[in-house]
């Protein structure tokens, strides 16, 4: 007996071939001997089966001795043995219909779990293997679970169902809802305008929810809510904003915040959370602000940074075009009695400059100038 695998919702063609290459009488029946369809001359006739409105054949193939049964919009319960009667012969075809669905929404928050459920006909014993967009393979029986979804899990999951050495492939599009970056760091000189951007790693037609940015300043003992906002159909509206600092927010996506001035008291870490409508849980993005200040007080030239810096970052003071006078893995460096000229304060990581502030030291009889 021939075995054919079908997918729920799909269309399947069950073939039946006669030795004579011409249109002759044929009938398709199910295992209960109920007629599905057949022909009377060149007319298509249908029986009283439950497939009635979903069963069809191709008249143009009859003249070639082919008498297919085409079943549209397959259901799991269409799984059955179908019998084609032609030329006093019976051809049996076993149809097994499978369905694979994500038993939650296919739009999931980063860190959530994905469960895929296989619907299969009674008596079948299929195995399932799924391949994620990043090439990770998972195997299972009736259900497959993936915990802690990551951004790279967004895309088409390809699942292969194996039964009777035959296979059928399902493709399921999964969207992992997350920010493009889990964390970002902004380096600014004191007084500069600060731009924070929170691009999303997904696109959906309508995006509605609400969000908040909590800020933990390095100098503060507790965190504080800097801004709360609403998102309606990708339009951003500010609900509440602190007076200090007075943040500004862009009205369109990607989420965009502007801090008018980088000041040492603002240096620290923030956590932007976004709660999406009809979703449990929230999206998070951490943002860090490092602020640099270079000053000269009497005979002391000082460079300081505030905010979350890694211990491997190097802070240096150097006279332009000369070797560094001082270079330390600390948050403040200074030079006593600096010689006149343009001094550079550099914050660098393995030789790559992250932040630079210049200060002009004038000969001792005049006051310093900051460009």
């Amino acid at each position: 007996k021939k075995v054919v695998l079908g997918k729920k919702g799909d269309t399947v063609e069950l073939t039946c071939t006669a030795s004579q290459k011409k249109s002759i009488q044929f009938h398709w029946k199910n295992s209960n001997q109920i007629k599905i369809l057949g022909n009377q001359g060149s007319f298509l006739t249908k029986g009283p089966s439950k497939l009635n409105d979903r069963a069809d054949s191709r008249r143009s193939l009859w003249d070639q001795g082919n008498f297919p049964l085409i079943i549209k919009n397959l259901k799991i319960e269409d799984s059955d043995t179908y019998i084609c009667e032609v030329e006093d012969q019976k051809e049996e075809v076993q149809l097994l219909v499978f369905g694979l669905t994500a038993n939650s929404d296919t739009h999931l928050l980063q860190g959530q779990s994905l469960t895929l459920t296989l619907e299969s006909p009674p008596g079948s014993s299929p195995s399932v293997q799924c391949r994620s967009p990043r090439g990770k393979n998972i195997q299972g029986g009736k259900t497959l679970s993936v915990s802690q979804l990551e951004l790279q899990d967004s895309g088409t999951w390809t699942c292969t169902v194996l039964q009777n050495q035959k296979k059928v492939e399902f493709k399921i599009d999964i969207v992992v809802l997350a920010f493009q970056k889990a964390s970002s760091i902004v380096y600014k000189k004191e007084g500069e305008q600060v731009e924070f951007s929170f691009p999303l790693a997904f696109t959906v037609e309508k995006l509605t929810g609400s969000g908040e940015l909590w800020w933990q300043a390095e100098r503060a003992s507790s965190s504080k809510s800097w801004i709360t906002f609403d998102l309606k159909n990708k339009e951003v509206s500010v609900k509440r904003v602190t007076q200090d600092p007075k943040l500004q927010m862009g009205k369109k996506l990607p989420l965009h915040l502007t801090l008018p001035q980088a000041l040492p008291q603002y240096a620290g870490s923030g956590n932007l959370t976004l709660a999406l409508e009809a979703k449990t849980g929230k999206l998070h993005q951490e943002v860090n602000l490092v602020v640099m200040r270079a000053t000269q007080l009497q005979k002391n030239l000082t460079c300081e940074v505030w905010g979350p810096t890694s211990p491997k970052l190097m802070l240096s003071l150097k006279l332009e075009n000369k070797e560094a006078k001082v270079s330390k893995r600390e948050k403040a460096v200074w030079v006593l009695n600096p010689e006149a000229g343009m001094w550079q304060c550099l914050l660098s990581d393995s030789g790559q400059v992250l932040l630079e502030s210049n200060i002009k030291v004038l000969p001792t009889w005049s006051t310093p100038v900051q460009p």
Epitope: T11, V12, S42, F43, L44, D56, R58, R59, S60, K72
Partner: antibody, heavy 115, light 107 residues
């Protein structure tokens, strides 16, 4: 809802090979036949040929010697190649889904053959 | 090949009119006939299949009848959106063939 999207070169010189591809989005790719039809002012609507998921083909005898229809099931796409084109092959070419009737059509591609 | 002949090749009518288009096959095709509507610059759209069955979404003012060699498409009460070209197609045998079309114009 099934959608058919087609593309390919629109301007050819005589004796060149016409090449068009049609992608099927949504709906079932299996169980159906996938056809190419052309429409020219002189000949009206003319069925070129068809293919199914298994690669089984049927061609219009009037064009059979010049036509090749192929399928790529991994991409839900099928393609038409028509060799040795002449000005008589200038037409709008459509891809379509069929069991007995053409119930879904592509947007059409105007192919002009001119020296 | 089965030849499909439509008549008339064009017809002028007014909104609200009843219009009948006929299609004749050069040999018997049982009920293996479909009707399509085509508007300028667009692909044909299936209206009627198996001679008299409605494709989903097609208004009930369209109806089809016939069997064997003679078939008709009737529009009971013309609407402005019905002014288009109509084609018949046989699915009885390869190669599938179409009628030459009937252009329905506003009077």
């Amino acid at each position: 809802q099934v959608q058919l999207q087609q593309w390919g070169a629109g301007l050819l010189k005589p004796s060149e090979t016409l090449s068009l591809t049609c992608a099927v989005y949504g709906g079932s790719f299996s169980g159906y036949y996938w056809s190419w039809i052309r429409q020219s002012p002189g000949k009206g609507l003319e069925w070129i040929g068809e293919i199914n998921q298994s690669g089984s083909t049927n061609y219009n005898p009037s064009l059979k010697s010049r036509v090749t229809i192929s399928v790529d099931t991994s991409k839900n796409q099928f393609s038409l190649k028509l060799s040795s084109v002449t000005a008589a092959d200038t037409a709008v070419y459509y891809c379509a889904r069929v069991i007995n009737w053409f119930d879904s059509w592509g947007q059409g591609t105007l192919v002009t053959v001119s020296s | 090949d089965i030849q499909m002949t439509q008549s008339p090749s064009s017809v002028s009518a007014s909104v609200g009119d009843r219009v009948t288009i006929t299609c004749r096959a050069s040999q018997g095709i049982s009920s293996w006939l479909a009707w399509y509507q085509q508007k300028p610059g667009k692909a044909p759209k299936l209206l009627i299949y198996a001679a008299s069955s409605f494709q989903s979404g097609v208004p009930s003012r369209f109806s089809g009848s016939g069997s064997g060699t003679d078939f008709t498409l009737t529009i009971s009460s013309l609407q402005t959106e019905d002014f288009a070209t109509y084609y018949c197609q046989q699915a009885n045998s390869f190669p599938y063939t179409f009628g030459q079309g009937t252009r329905l114009e506003i009077k």
